[in-house]
C-alpha cells in the first residue's frame, strides 16, 4: 500500500528528539504554500493554508516516520502552532509507482489578512540534540481582501470584497472625465478621486438605486492614464471599505453617453 499521512497537533518537541538516532532521513526537497477556501457553514468560509512538501528521492526516506510543520504568524497578534503528519506506511520506493517524487499536503492553519507567516518543516526522526537539524522554511504573506480566495472572508465581504463595480473611466475632453460604475447594494455613498501625482478631480456620489451610474467629473489637467479611485461607504464597513481603482482612457465615439441632467451627479469638484 502507498503511504498516506495522518496529521494532528503537536505543540512541544517531538518525542524522537529525546532519543539518539544513528541515522536520520534527509531533509525535504521542496515546501510550498497556497490558500484554500473551505466552507464552514452556509455563507461562512474559512481560509486555510494548503501546505505541500516533496520528499527527497533517496533511500533515506526508508527511515522517515513523520514530517512536522510549524507556522508562526506576525502581525498585531503573534501566533505559533505545529502539526505532526505521520506516514501510515514505510516507503517501499524512492518515487511514486506512477512516477515523480512523493508529495504530500496538509490543509490547516487559519489565515488572517495581510499577515507574514513563516512556515517551517522537518522530517522525523530529526537530527540528534546537538546536531544541525535539516529543515526547510518558506515565508508567506497572506494577501488582502481583493485576493480571489481571501475575498470570501467575512470581514472582506463586509468591506465589499464581492462587489464588482466594473469601473470604466474615459476622458471626454480636456476638462471632463466620465466615470461609470455599478453601485453596491450595501451602501449609497461613494467618493471618486482622479489622481496622477496630485488629485486632478474629485466627486462625491449619492446613489440609492442598484444600477450602473455615470458621473461627470471636472479635472484640472491632462487626465488620460490617470488613476480613478472609487471608495464606497457601506453599512458594514463605514470608512474602512475596500477602495477600487480604474484608469482613465480616451472616450471612444461609442462610449456610453452621460445621462441627462436629472441623473447626472456633479457633486464636489
Amino acid at each position: 500500500r502507498e503511504p498516506t499521512i495522518q496529521c494532528g497537533s503537536e505543540t512541544g518537541p517531538s518525542p524522537e528528539w529525546m532519543v539518539q538516532h544513528t541515522l536520520t532521513p534527509g531533509d525535504l526537497r521542496d515546501l510550498q504554500v497556497e490558500l484554500v477556501k473551505t466552507s464552514v457553514a452556509a455563507e461562512e468560509f474559512s481560509i486555510l493554508m494548503n501546505i505541500s512538501w516533496i520528499l527527497r528521492a533517496d533511500a533515506s526516506i526508508r527511515l522517515l516516520k513523520a514530517t512536522k510543520i510549524c507556522v508562526s504568524g506576525k502581525n498585531n497578534m503573534n501566533s505559533y502552532s505545529c502539526v505532526r503528519c505521520n506516514y501510515t506506511e514505510a516507503f517501499q520506493s524512492q518515487t511514486r509507482p506512477s512516477g515523480g517524487k512523493w508529495t504530500f499536503s496538509y490543509v490547516g492553519f487559519p489565515v488572517e489578512l495581510s499577515t507574514l507567516y513563516l512556515i517551517s518543516a522537518h522530517n522525523i526522526p530529526n537530527a540528534n540534540m546537538n546536531e544541525d537539524s535539516p529543515s526547510l522554511s518558506v515565508n508567506f504573506t497572506s494577501p488582502g481582501c481583493l485576493n480571489h480566495v481571501m475575498k470570501y472572508k467575512k470581514q472582506c465581504t463586509e468591506a465589499g470584497s464581492l462587489w464588482d463595480p466594473d469601473i470604466t473611466a474615459c476622458k471626454k475632453n480636456e476638462k471632463m472625465v466620465e466615470v461609470n460604475f455599478t453601485t453596491n447594494p450595501l451602501g449609497n455613498r461613494y467618493t471618486i478621486l482622479i489622481q496622477r501625482d496630485t488629485t486632478l478631480g474629485f466627486s462625491r456620489v449619492l446613489e440609492n438605486k442598484l444600477m450602473r451610474t455615470s458621473v461627470a467629473i471636472p479635472v484640472t489637467e491632462e487626465s488620460e492614464g490617470a488613476v480613478v479611485q472609487l471608495t464606497p461607504y457601506l453599512h458594514t464597513c463605514g470608512n474602512d471599505c475596500i477602495r477600487r481603482e480604474g484608469t482613465v482612457v480616451l472616450c471612444s465615439e461609442t462610449s456610453a453617453p452621460i445621462p441627462p441632467d436629472d441623473n447626472r451627479r456633479m457633486l464636489g469638484g
Epitope: D58, A59, R62, L63, Q94, T95, G99
Partner: antibody, heavy 118, light 107 residues
Framework: QVQLVQSGAEVKKPGASVKVSCKAS????????MNWVRQAPGQGLEWMGR????????QYNQKFKDRVTMTRDTSISTAYMELSRLRSDDTAVYYC???????????WGQGTLVTVSS | DIQMTQSPSSLSASVGDRVTITCRAS??????LAWYQQKPGKAPKLLLY???NLADGVPSRFSGSGSGTDYTLTISSLQPEDFATYYC?????????FGGGTKVEIK
Amino acid sequence: QVQLVQSGAEVKKPGASVKVSCKASGYTFISYWMNWVRQAPGQGLEWMGRIDPYDSEIQYNQKFKDRVTMTRDTSISTAYMELSRLRSDDTAVYYCARSGGFDWFAYWGQGTLVTVSS
Amino acid sequence: DIQMTQSPSSLSASVGDRVTITCRASENINSNLAWYQQKPGKAPKLLLYDVTNLADGVPSRFSGSGSGTDYTLTISSLQPEDFATYYCQHFWGPPYTFGGGTKVEIK
C-alpha cells in the same frame, strides 16, 4: 521485458564532446530514475549521476559536474548523457542503468565504448 | 562520499567451493547495499539488493548478509558460470559508489 538499448561506439578527439543515448522499453519510462555509470578499461565501476525522467531532476557526481549534462525525451523514452571537454582518461564503456525501488541498478544497457584519442 | 572497500581483490576457487566476498562501507549505510556480477565484455548484472534480496532469476546459491558497515556475499557452491568479477554498491543517497571489485578465477 525491460530493455535499455544504447547508441553505438564513438571515437573522439581530446577536447571534443560525446553524447550517448539510452532508449528504454518494457516499462513506464517516467517511473524510475536513470543512472549513468562508466567503466574504464580494466577498472571498476564509477557512478556519474542520475536523472528523474518525470521532472528532469538531476544529481551529478561532483567529479563530473562541470562536464556532464543529462537530459531525457519522454516522448521517445530516451535518456541522454553528454560529456564535454573529453580527455584520454575518459576512454571507457558508458552504461545507462535503471534504478529499482531505490537506487540499486536493476537493468543495464549494453554499454557504449567511447574512445578518446588524438 | 562513502567509500566502499571490497576484499579480496581476487581469489582462486574450484567448482563446488564456498566463496565469501566482503565489502566494508566507510560509514553506516543502513543495509542499502547491492551486489553485481560482471563477465568480460558484458554489462554488470544485479544479484542482490537490500543485502539479502535476490534479484529476479538469480540462483539461490547466492546469498548476502551484514548490517551497518560490514557486508558479505556468499556463493554456497561455486558453479562454472560463476567465474566473474563481483562488485558491491551502496545506495544510501547520492553519490553512489562501488567497491573495487573481486575477481573470482578458476583454481
